[in-house]
Interface confidence: medium
């Protein structure tokens, strides 16, 4: 077994002793920036630079593949089956980011039951499930590997999931084909995605300096927290349930429950573009309210 | 080869305490985590506590505040003290250490049995 699959979310080869097994990744129980984290409402900080995050809105094709530890889906390139020739990369900007990076992959984490599966949690309240869309950052470096352990290296769009009857289109092309990837090794194509159709209908977002929220956990990872969930079914979620870490002789356990617990967030702030105030009473663009007394709090559809 | 081996197992009252050992033939001071996992009948196997090199534990959370794990690295020995036990407990104990060579490697014991009467 190779360091970088030996590895699991609970145990003792769990994410208390990540950082104790393997003196490479150190960071996991030493690191001051770590992710996940819980977002508290009322210590968002405002500010007015933060721009929308833009994501390229073209399709692209790749694999999505059960690891054994989580469902990846990953950008594929001209030397996969079934592209029609070289893609156009799909890239991140905008935000908090000083860069444009390069979108690498895609991230599930999800429970064995709805009241945990996120990374990230909203005063304390997880959701069912969290899709992590990365990137690297394409103009200081060649690819996702190198970027990883840089600085400023990597951007991770966190996307929360509500249970909801009807399910966002472009997660259901995902779990279309989870069928296909039940044991750890599987994986299938995806053709034509829509990274940008993922993201929930909104602009605004909360973002934190922090880690990649496995092994080794580097702490290059500029994260956005995107402040709209998007919605699951029931059903996708059972079939999320149904895939296994291991291979059809030797399933070993189910693949949920692949989430990461919350880390210290110490000194780091978190800013938000959230502004409660855009315009004045006649009709005229206010300012952006920096009052220390304006406090965010959570609202009530995270009890839905 | 490692080899692990549990003692301490046995029948003890609803509220009784029992302390677990696990030998190993082979030093410890390389299994930078050492732990106790349990499997109840007809139950998966669950983890109940860890312990790292440096002292750093871990515990389930049907565990916490009840269960202590400890090890004594001199003696190649870690230990998982019961208290308060419930008939929740009841369960087959089993002793895993984490060895770090050229590649990690997960050693087991053969497991003890604890049973708790209410």
């Known amino acids: 077994v190779s360091w970088e699959d030996w590895w699991t979310y609970d145990g003792i080869s769990g994410p208390a002793f990540w950082g104790l097994i393997n003196p490479e990744w150190s960071l996991c129980n030493k690191g001051r920036r770590q992710s996940p984290v819980n977002l508290e409402p009322q210590r968002l900080l405002f500010d007015p630079n933060l721009r929308p995050m833009h994501i390229d809105k073209h399709r692209i094709s790749g694999l999505i593949t059960n690891t054994g530890h989580s469902v990846i889906f990953t950008a594929g390139n001209d030397t996969v089956a079934n592209y029609d020739g070289m893609q156009t990369p799909v890239n991140i900007s905008g935000g908090p980011l000083s860069y444009r990076y390069r979108f690498h992959e895609i991230h599930m984490h999800y429970g064995l039951n709805d009241q945990f599966g996120s990374e990230h949690s909203v005063e304390g309240y997880t959701f069912p499930a969290e899709i992590q869309i990365f990137g690297y950052n394409s103009q200081l470096y060649a690819n996702f590997s190198d970027a990883l352990n840089r600085a400023q290296g990597i951007v991770g769009v966190s996307i929360l999931l509500q249970l909801g009857d009807l399910s966002n289109a472009e997660l259901r092309m995902l779990t279309d084909q989870l069928e296909r990837i039940r044991y750890g090794g599987d994986e299938a194509f995806v053709k034509r995605l829509s990274i940008r159709g993922l993201l929930p209908d909104t602009d605004h977002y909360m973002t934190y300096d922090g880690s990649t929220t496995a092994p080794a956990c580097h702490e290059t990872v500029t994260w956005v927290v995107l402040n709209k969930p998007i919605y699951i079914t029931k059903q996708q979620l059972h079939a999320l349930r149904r895939l296994m870490q291991g291979s059809p002789d030797h399933p070993k356990a189910p693949l949920g429950n692949n989430y990461r617990p919350p880390q210290p967030l110490l000194h780091r702030p978190i800013r938000t573009n959230i502004d409660f105030k855009t315009t004045k009473s006649n009709g005229k663009a206010a300012c952006p309210t920096m009052y220390r007394e304006v406090y965010y709090k959570a609202t009530s559809w995270k009890q839905n | 080869q490692v080899q692990l081996q549990e003692s301490g197992g046995g029948l003890v009252q609803a509220g009784g305490s029992l302390r677990l050992s696990c030998a190993a033939s082979?030093?410890?001071?390389?299994?930078?985590?050492m732990g106790w996992y349990r499997q109840a009948p007809g139950k998966e196997r669950e983890f109940v506590a860890g312990i790292s090199l440096g002292g750093n534990t871990n515990y389930a959370d049907s565990v916490k505040g009840r269960f202590t794990i400890s090890r004594d690295n001199a003696k190649n020995t870690v230990y998982l003290q019961m208290n308060s036990l419930k008939p929740e407990d009841t369960a087959v104990y089993y002793c895993?250490?984490?060895?770090?060579?050229?590649?990690?490697?997960?050693?087991w014991g053969q497991g003890t049995q604890v049973t708790v009467s209410s």
């Open positions: 082979g030093t410890i001071s390389y299994a930078p985590v």
């Open positions: 895993a250490a984490v060895y770090v060579g050229s590649s990690p490697y997960e050693y």
